[in-house]
């Protein structure tokens, strides 16, 4: 499936739109809001009852090349005594983001948009109990 | 930009970095993954730091719909089902890349935009600041 074209419900295509070959789109990868910073609470990944670690994945043919992934440290959750409670579950919270993939076919290069699922952190949930009949 | 390896047999005119503007295939790889977090899991309700999901819609952006999490409580849900303020619910935020129509309203011309979204919530031990 493709990116939806602009529907007449919202607006008409302006005359100022750049010409684009069929089946492709023009993408400026100079990022808007490049310098905004995440203002997340201090070190929540270690203060959480479902703590997590971060690993950086690197791919020179991807833009951005660096993507940070979280992994839950425990299967259970950390209780008030600092011990793992396996009656609760640490589970990953995921979010999709877009990346640009650079593909080499011989000496020619093409670009492809790709959805990547990023694990952002973990949360502590009550488990779903499946009883055997 | 990002330096990428090049086939040694190719002409040297090729830039090692990602160019500022690229032509991209309209088809998105992995496009059909589930974008509605309410359908993909019920963690938002089962979490000890539950959250509500708010729909953010913008036709000038792809994806046009993004779900924003807002922690339901300031405290966390304890074993008795009460909200316990000895612990705090906090949002987990993530910067994601989206496409912004540029110039506005153009169907096939975009610019990458970084936006900050709250994806869910987690329960943390609070940092206590006492007055001296």
């Amino acid at each position: 499936r493709k990116i939806p074209k602009v529907g007449h419900t919202f607006f008409q295509k302006p005359e100022s739109c750049p010409p684009v070959p069929g089946g492709s789109m023009k993408l400026d990868i100079g990022i808007i809001n490049e310098n905004q910073r995440v203002s997340m609470s201090r070190n929540i990944e270690s203060r959480s009852t479902s703590p997590w670690n971060y690993t950086v994945t690197w791919d020179p043919n991807r833009y951005p090349s660096e993507v940070v992934q979280a992994q839950c440290r425990n299967l259970g959750c950390i209780n008030a005594q600092g011990k793992e409670d396996i009656s609760m579950n640490s589970v990953p919270i995921q979010q999709e983001t877009l990346v640009v993939r650079r593909k080499h076919q011989g000496c020619s290069v093409s670009f492809q948009l790709e959805k990547v699922l990023v694990t952002v952190g973990c949360t502590c949930v009550t488990p779903v109990i499946h009883h055997v009949q | 930009g990002i330096t990428i390896p090049r086939n040694p047999g190719c002409p040297n005119s090729e830039d090692k970095n990602f160019p500022r503007t690229v032509m991209v295939n309209l088809n998105i790889h992995n496009r059909n993954t589930n974008t509605n977090p309410k359908r993909s899991s019920d963690y938002y309700n089962r979490s000890t730091s539950p959250w509500n999901l708010h729909r953010n819609e913008d036709p000038e952006r792809y994806p046009s719909v993004i779900w924003e999490a807002k922690c339901r409580h300031l405290g966390c849900i304890n074993a008795d089902g009460n909200v316990d303020y000895h612990m705090n619910s906090v949002p987990i935020q993530q910067e994601i890349l989206v496409l912004r129509r540029e110039p506005p309203h153009c169907p096939n011309s975009f610019r990458l935009e970084k936006i900050l979204v709250s994806v869910g919530c987690t329960c943390v031990t609070p940092i206590v600041h006492h007055v001296a």
Epitope: S41 | C71, D84, Y85
Partner: antibody, heavy 121, light 112 residues
Framework: EVQLVESGGGLVQPGGSLRLSCAAS????????VHWVRQATGKGLEWVSV???????TYNSALKSRFTISRENAKNSLYLQMNSLRAGDTAVYYC???????????????WGQGTTVTVSS | DIVMTQSPLSLPVTPGEPASISCRSS???????????FHWYLQKPGQSPQLLIY???NRFSGVPDRFSGSGSGTDFTLKISRVEAEDVGVYYC?????????FGQGTKLEIK
């Protein structure tokens, strides 16, 4: 129009029980938290308890063992069951609506007129 | 429990003059999420309390713009730029960052 009307107050002997009601109109209890706050004559405000929009609760731990908050969505009503009452529980009891769960302000935006509870022998 | 200390406890003011009430909390009211759940209420004589300011500095709907709130962490202030006769009553500060939620002891504003 948002309205909160408390009832059920009265004179009760020490050790007795009382159930206060708060009838809400103009909004739905499954979209708002509602608090109980009390005020002894000539004194300040003391927070008692809250039931949040999702049905979870938070109590003033000093009162939790004796007081229980509940609600009945079908009647759009809130209750405060008070047991083992003492003279120190004598006060006007207000129910107050918390701001809408989509606003996340955690402030009490509308208050009822209050119902008076007197604990005396 | 968080102790909220207001000053002054009594505030006689001439109509048209400014007024200021301070409130200090025994612990920071900044939640782990970065927000501060500090509010001001007014209880007019014979009435129920009413919300004036929420989350430090936001005026509740219908509250005149002569009321303003400021502060951070543990120290907060309510200012009335020009006091009017209808502003008399007891002003309470309150916090909902930590449970139990607590109120200040109240500041009684009266007209001179």
């Amino acid at each position: 129009e948002v309205q909160l009307v408390e009832s059920g107050g009265g004179l009760v002997q020490p050790g007795g029980s009382l159930r206060l009601s708060c009838a809400a109109s103009g909004f739905s209890l499954d979209s708002y938290g509602v608090h109980w706050v009390r005020q002894a004559t000539g004194k300040g405000l003391e927070w008692v308890s809250v039931i949040w929009s999702d049905g979870t609760t938070t109590y003033n731990s000093a009162l939790k063992s004796r007081f229980t908050i509940s609600r009945e969505n079908a009647k759009n009503s809130l209750y405060l069951q008070m047991n083992s009452l003492r003279a120190g529980d004598t006060a006007v009891y207000y129910c107050a609506r918390d701001t809408h769960y989509r606003l996340y302000y955690y402030a009490m935006d509308y208050w009822g007129q209050g119902t008076t509870v007197t604990v005396s022998s | 429990d968080i102790v909220m200390t207001q000053s002054p406890l009594s505030l006689p003011v001439t109509p048209g003059e400014p007024a200021s009430i301070s409130c200090r909390s025994s612990q920071s009211l900044v939640h782990s999420n970065g927000d501060t759940y500090f509010h001001w209420y007014l209880q007019k004589p014979g009435q129920s309390p009413q919300l004036l300011i929420y989350k430090v500095s936001n005026r509740f709907s219908g509250v005149p713009d002569r009321f303003s709130g400021s502060g951070s962490g543990t120290d907060f202030t309510l200012k009335i730029s020009r006091v009017e006769a209808e502003d008399v009553g007891v002003y309470y500060c309150s916090q909902t960052t930590h449970a139990p939620f607590t109120f200040g002891q109240g500041t009684k504003l009266e007209i001179k």
